[in-house]
């Protein structure tokens, strides 16, 4: 059994998340994840889910009762989602930490917009073989 | 030329984002995007970047001077990033709109954590061929 399971159960107790009423009104994440089979689509959704959990954990980082559980789970996310790749995790964290109300950040974001947009679709990537693979993947996932 | 280019130039004027000093202290997004060649890694990063732009646009949605530009750019993101798939965009929006401080949302998130974690790594998906492809891809992108 993965170590995160025991720690997630500990979090459940802390948040009273094992109560039957928690399942009322559908799921937050699970139904959405079931909708997307193609890996690139799943990453789009999981990226948002992981950033949600990181924000949640940040809000409770000073609570000693769950600190070990939170650290264990974060470590497991780093292994599973970021392939133990610190640079990937650091780049992700940078993106999640930008303040959308900071005028300097706003100006930079708008300055970079055209180039960001040009790279958004898989077909925009260079390399004919890669591009044709992408295109097949996109069609299959739609 | 894609229609978003003209509208992005309009946003640049509005935010004074064409000034030379905007490039000071590095980029927000472009250097990070250059780091990641593998499509699934790019989607992880682009997911955060797109949600940043959507939040930014939301903050300025009532400003008539840039409303048309914002709508055109959002439409182009929907085409390029979400493949014109409304369900994909709707699921993404749901995820970005969850409030991390809402106790009911917190409880649901913790309740779902074990299942979310179990699906985080590509290897968790069924299919030996798919899994081995993923692993090759993952190594190449680290």
């Amino acid at each position: 059994q993965d170590p995160y399971v025991k720690e997630a159960e500990n979090l459940k107790k802390y948040f009273n998340a094992g109560d039957p009423d928690v399942a009322d009104n559908g799921t937050l994440f699970l139904d959405i994840l079931r909708n997307w089979k193609e890996e690139s689509d799943r990453k789009i959704m999981q990226s948002q889910i992981v950033s949600f959990y990181f924000k949640l954990f940040k809000n409770f980082k000073d609570d000693q009762r769950i600190q070990k559980s939170v650290e264990t789970i974060k470590e497991d996310i780093n292994v599973k989602f970021f392939n133990s790749n610190k640079k990937k995790r650091d780049d992700f964290e940078k993106l999640t930490n930008y303040s959308v109300t900071d005028s300097n950040v706003q100006r930079k974001a708008v300055h970079e917009l055209i180039q960001v947009m040009a790279e958004l679709s898989p077909a925009a990537k260079i390399g004919k073989r890669k591009r044709s693979q992408m295109f097949r993947g996109r069609r299959a996932s739609q | 030329q894609d229609p978003y280019v003209k509208e992005a130039e309009n946003l640049k004027k509005y935010f004074n984002a064409g000034d030379p000093d905007v490039a000071d202290n590095g980029t927000l997004f472009l250097d990070i995007l250059r780091n990641w060649k593998e499509e699934s890694d790019r989607k992880i990063m682009q997911s955060q970047i797109v949600s940043f732009y959507f939040k930014l646009f939301k903050n300025f949605k009532d400003d008539q001077r840039i409303q048309k530009s914002v709508e055109t750019i959002k439409e182009d993101i929907n085409v390029k990033f979400f493949n014109s798939n409304k369900k994909k965009r709707d699921d993404f929006e749901k995820l970005t709109n969850y409030s991390v401080t809402d106790s009911n949302v917190q409880r649901k998130a913790v309740h779902e954590l074990i299942q979310v974690m179990a699906e985080l790594s590509p290897a968790a998906k069924i299919g030996k061929r798919k899994r081995s492809q993923m692993f090759r891809g993952r190594r190449a992108s680290q």
């Epitope: 739609q142 | 929907n78 014109s84 369900k87």
Partner: antibody
Framework: EVQLLESGGGLVQPGGSLRLSCAAS????????MSWVRQAPGKGLEWVSA????????YYADSVKGRFTISRDNSKNTLYLQMNSLRAEDTAVYYC????????????????WGQGTLVTVSS | NFMLTQPHSVSESPGKTVTISCTRS????????VQWYQQRPGSSPTTVIY?????PSGVPDRFSGSIDSSSNSASLTISGLKTEDEADYYC??????????FGGGTKLTVL
Amino acid sequence: EVQLLESGGGLVQPGGSLRLSCAASGFTFSSYAMSWVRQAPGKGLEWVSAISGSGGSTYYADSVKGRFTISRDNSKNTLYLQMNSLRAEDTAVYYCAKDGSSGWYVPHWFDPWGQGTLVTVSS
Amino acid sequence: NFMLTQPHSVSESPGKTVTISCTRSSGSIASNYVQWYQQRPGSSPTTVIYEDNQRPSGVPDRFSGSIDSSSNSASLTISGLKTEDEADYYCQSYDGSNRWMFGGGTKLTVL
């Protein structure tokens, strides 16, 4: 109340042309993607063509590509379908339909539908 | 392109429940919204379910829509059948490549 009223159908010989119109009222026409859907006699529904709210993007079924042209005049709240090189298999009731979801630039579903106009291609 | 396959016809008695299936031939049924239209004889189609499971105002809650990823199909369920429900029913989805697909239609007979 949203209303869509098609016109322009009729009998035409193979190889001939027709122009269908759809007059829209009861909603902000330019905010919605619009479509044409057809139904051959006794058969099912077949999507034919779609156009974004601005008119900047158009989409066609493979069966009509290169022969049919969709357009719209937002100042007149009217949708058009120019049909050229008509074939016997184009015989159908043609429905004009509004996108059910506001502000999405390609239609995802169709609501409401007009009453339809019959196009008969026969010699 | 995928196809949406529906049974040609179904029949059931008034007051009973009937389910009409719509199976997607390739790609995931869950990855695009599914709609259901009712077409009574001599009339234009009207929406009874949109975006998988949403009911337009005016459509009774006897109509419900669902998605089943394991069978890669969508379903329209009508409970408490009435004679006025007798009609053709079509499922529809967007294929992601700027094409809109309809199922072949199912004729519902209320016995």
